[in-house]
C-alpha cells in the first residue's frame, strides 16, 4: 500500500495542522508546531509552495486561512522568493502573485520522488 505517499495525505495534514493555533489539546499543539516548522523549512529550502502549488492555500478550507487575512496572506510568506536575508524579495508582488516573486511549484513533486525511491528501492 502506497497511500502514505499520496499528495492527498500530505495536503490533509498541511491544511489541518499548518499554523493551527487552536487545537483541542496540548499534544495536538505540539504536533501542529512541528508540522508548521517542517513545512516552513521545506518551502524555504526547496523553493516550493504547498503540496500541489500556491492554489492549495486558496482552494481549500485550512487552519492557515482561518488564522490569516486573504489580502495579507494569500499563501504563507515562505512561498515568496526570498533575498539572502530570508526576507521576501518583494512582498507586495508576492502577495499579488507576480511571476518571479513567489514559488509556483508544489512541494509534493520535489519530495515524493526521493521518498518513493527510499520506500520502494
Amino acid at each position: 500500500q502506497r497511500d502514505f505517499f499520496t499528495p492527498n495525505l500530505f495536503l490533509k495534514q498541511m491544511l489541518e495542522r499548518y499554523q493551527n493555533n487552536s487545537p483541542p489539546n496540548n499534544d495536538d499543539q505540539w504536533k501542529n508546531n512541528g508540522v508548521t516548522k517542517t513545512w516552513d523549512r521545506l518551502m524555504l529550502q526547496d523553493n516550493c509552495c504547498g503540496v500541489n502549488g500556491p492554489s492549495d492555500w486558496q482552494k481549500y478550507t485550512s487552519a492557515f486561512r482561518t488564522e490569516n487575512n486573504d489580502a495579507d496572506y494569500p499563501w504563507p510568506r515562505q512561498c515568496c522568493v526570498m533575498n539572502n536575508l530570508k526576507e521576501p524579495l518583494n512582498l507586495e508582488a508576492c502577495k499579488l502573485g507576480v511571476p518571479g516573486f513567489y514559488h509556483n511549484q508544489g512541494c509534493y513533486e520535489l519530495i515524493s520522488g526521493p521518498m518513493n525511491r527510499h520506500a520502494w528501492g
Epitope: N83, L85, E87, N90
Partner: antibody
C-alpha cells in the same frame, strides 16, 4: 548620477533630540531599501538602521545600540530619508551617512554613500 | 552578531606594488562579503560586493577573493589615489557588521 545629501547634524546635549535628513536623487528612490551608517571619530563604520520599500511594508531594522531611541523613516514622494534620534548619548557622537542598499537577491551591500553629517553629543 | 576582524590596522606599500588586505568573519558568511574604500576626506565608496564582484566604475586593479570565513582584497598595481582606509563588511545576516579597517599608506 546617484546623489545622497545629508543634513541636520550639529551639537546637541545628552538626552536631547535631533532629526537627520537625506535628500536622494538620480535613482528610483521608492524601490530601494535605505540605511544609516555611522562612524565615531577615529573609529570604524557601524550600521545603524534600515528601512525597506513600500512594497515591503516599510519594514524597519535597528542596531541594538540605538533600538527604542532612533526611528528611521522615509517620504517616497519627496525622495527623502530621515533618522529621528532621541535620548542621545555621548557615544552617539559620529559622522552619519545616508546609504542606498544594493538590490536583487543579495541585498546586504551598500552601493552608494552620502558625504555624511556630523552629530556631536556633548554637555 | 557576526564579528569581522581585520588584523592589519595599517599597511605601508610602494606605488606599483601588489597589496593584499585580509578580513575574517567569526562564522561562515557564504561569500556575502563587501569591501569599501574611505578616503582621508571621509568619502566612502563601494569597491567589491559578494566577495569578488566589481562595483560599477571601480578600476580593474581591485579584486576580491575568499570563501567561508576568510576573505581578501587585492590591489594589483598600487596608485597614489588608492591611499585610503579599507573596510570589509558582511551582508549575510542582520545586523550588518564591518571590520575595523586597514589604513593603506605609501612607503
Amino acid at each position: 548620477e546617484v546623489q545622497l545629501v545629508e543634513s541636520g547634524g550639529g551639537l546637541v546635549q545628552p538626552k536631547g533630540s535631533l532629526k537627520l535628513s537625506c535628500a536622494a536623487s538620480g535613482f528610483s528612490f521608492n524601490t530601494y531599501a535605505m540605511n544609516w551608517v555611522r562612524q565615531a571619530p577615529g573609529k570604524g563604520l557601524e550600521w545603524v538602521a534600515r528601512i525597506r520599500s513600500k512594497s515591503n511594508n516599510y519594514a524597519t531594522y535597528y542596531a541594538d545600540s540605538v533600538k527604542d531611541r532612533f526611528t528611521i523613516s522615509r517620504d517616497d514622494s519627496e525622495s527623502m530619508l530621515y533618522l529621528q534620534m532621541n535620548n542621545l548619548k555621548t557615544e552617539d557622537t559620529a559622522m552619519y551617512y545616508c546609504v542606498r542598499q544594493g538590490d536583487g537577491y543579495y541585498v546586504g551591500w551598500f552601493a552608494y554613500w552620502g558625504q555624511g553629517t556630523l552629530v556631536t553629543v556633548s554637555a | 552578531d557576526i564579528q569581522m576582524t581585520q588584523t592589519t590596522s595599517s599597511l605601508s606599500a610602494s606605488l606599483g606594488d601588489r597589496v593584499t588586505i585580509s578580513c575574517r568573519a567569526s562564522q561562515d558568511i557564504s561569500n556575502y562579503l563587501n569591501w569599501y574604500q574611505q578616503k582621508p576626506d571621509g568619502t566612502v565608496k563601494l569597491l567589491i560586493y559578494y566577495t569578488s564582484r566589481l562595483h560599477s566604475g571601480v578600476p580593474s586593479r581591485f579584486s576580491g577573493s575568499g570563501s567561508g570565513t576568510d576573505y581578501s582584497l587585492t590591489i594589483s598595481n598600487l596608485e597614489q589615489e588608492d591611499i585610503a582606509t579599507y573596510f570589509c563588511q558582511q551582508g549575510n545576516t542582520l545586523p550588518f557588521t564591518f571590520g575595523s579597517g586597514t589604513k593603506l599608506e605609501i612607503k
